[in-house]
Amino acid sequence: MMTGTIETTGNISAEKGGSIILQCHLSSTTAQVTQVNWEQQDQLLAICNADLGWHISPSFKDRVAPGPGLGLTLQSLTVNDTGEYFCIYHTYPDGTYTGRIFLEVLESSVAEHGARFQIP
């Protein structure tokens, strides 16, 4: 039975040209995290494997930095970066947990962080 929950940074906004940290946290389970995949709609951003380390997709390698922790730092933001991001936690023995973050990249300086929320 999957008992864990993913806590994410929720709906967030950031300024064009700036950077943002995408962060998820798995709680309420003793399952071992073997890998975390970061995805944006239909493409992979990065993988963090507990043994093999980080893999950054070529389309993001110039502006994605691993971490902090299992999170991902997205740099040099453009308006095209607006959209949904997913953290997929591969765990043993539970299986897969998925968290969702919505990022809005704004032209102006009115960007503020949204509230944190949980996905069961």
Partner: antibody, heavy 115, light 107 residues
């Protein structure tokens, strides 16, 4: 030029063990993961496991966890794979390969298990 | 484990033809897919990684597309040296797995 140079062919008896090597050159050893792949009957490819020279992490395909053991010698930029309790089913060509998508491959080591 | 299925074991083609080789994943693999070419007696050679990126030195007649569970590899105009076996592979999650291969041959 990136090169992965594997050890030569092996003929071993059932029940024995064998250790094959893959010496790397032409790049910074700790920057890329290294993997072993089995090819049986000149067709099917199977990932055995991989090694991260940067942190010493090893990830095995569960199917090969008992069969294979991966080690490295950082001083010579060489990775090794030991295969134990060999049977005829282990007869195959074994390749070492670099990176997540295997961008460079060794020439292959042919293992024949026969009495 | 994720199963990568290449439904065509053999594809017959003529020189100059356009060929699509498909690979279907049993689970979502996003764009964590590579394509390899293996000629007889040789080691596999990386052609495409991250579903659509050509490896260094690979001719532009080779392209890759797709995401999720349906991945496609295309040769826009088949040349004699392209006659080989082509494999897809996922590295979305371990254990990394390969398709069974598609042999490209002349009609």
């Amino acid at each position: 030029e990136v090169q992965l140079q594997q050890s030569g062919p092996e003929l071993v008896k059932p029940g024995a063990s064998v250790k094959i090597s893959c010496k790397t050159s032409g790049y910074t050893f700790s920057d890329y993961t290294l993997h072993w792949v089995k090819q049986s009957h000149g067709k099917n490819l199977e990932w055995i496991g991989g090694f991260n020279p940067n942190n010493g992490g090893t990830n095995y395909n569960q199917k090969f966890k008992v069969k294979a053991s991966l080690t490295i010698d950082k001083s010579s930029n060489t990775v090794y794979m030991e295969l134990r309790s060999l049977s005829s089913e282990d007869s195959a060509v074994y390749y070492c390969a670099r990176n997540w998508a295997f961008d460079y491959w060794g020439q292959g080591t042919t293992l024949t298990v026969s009495s | 484990d994720i199963v990568m299925t290449q439904s065509h074991k053999i594809m017959s083609t003529s020189l100059g033809d356009r060929v699509n080789i498909t690979c279907k994943a049993s689970q979502h693999v996003s764009t964590a897919v590579a394509w390899y070419q293996q000629r007889p007696g040789q080691s596999p050679r990386l052609l495409i990684y991250s579903a659509s990126y050509r490896h260094t030195g690979v001719p532009d007649r080779f392209t890759g597309s797709g995401s999720g569970t349906d991945i496609t590899f295309t040769i826009s105009s088949v040349q004699t040296e392209d006659l080989a076996v082509y494999y897809c592979q996922q590295y979305y999650t371990t254990p990394w797995t390969f398709g069974g291969g598609t042999k490209l041959e002349i009609k």
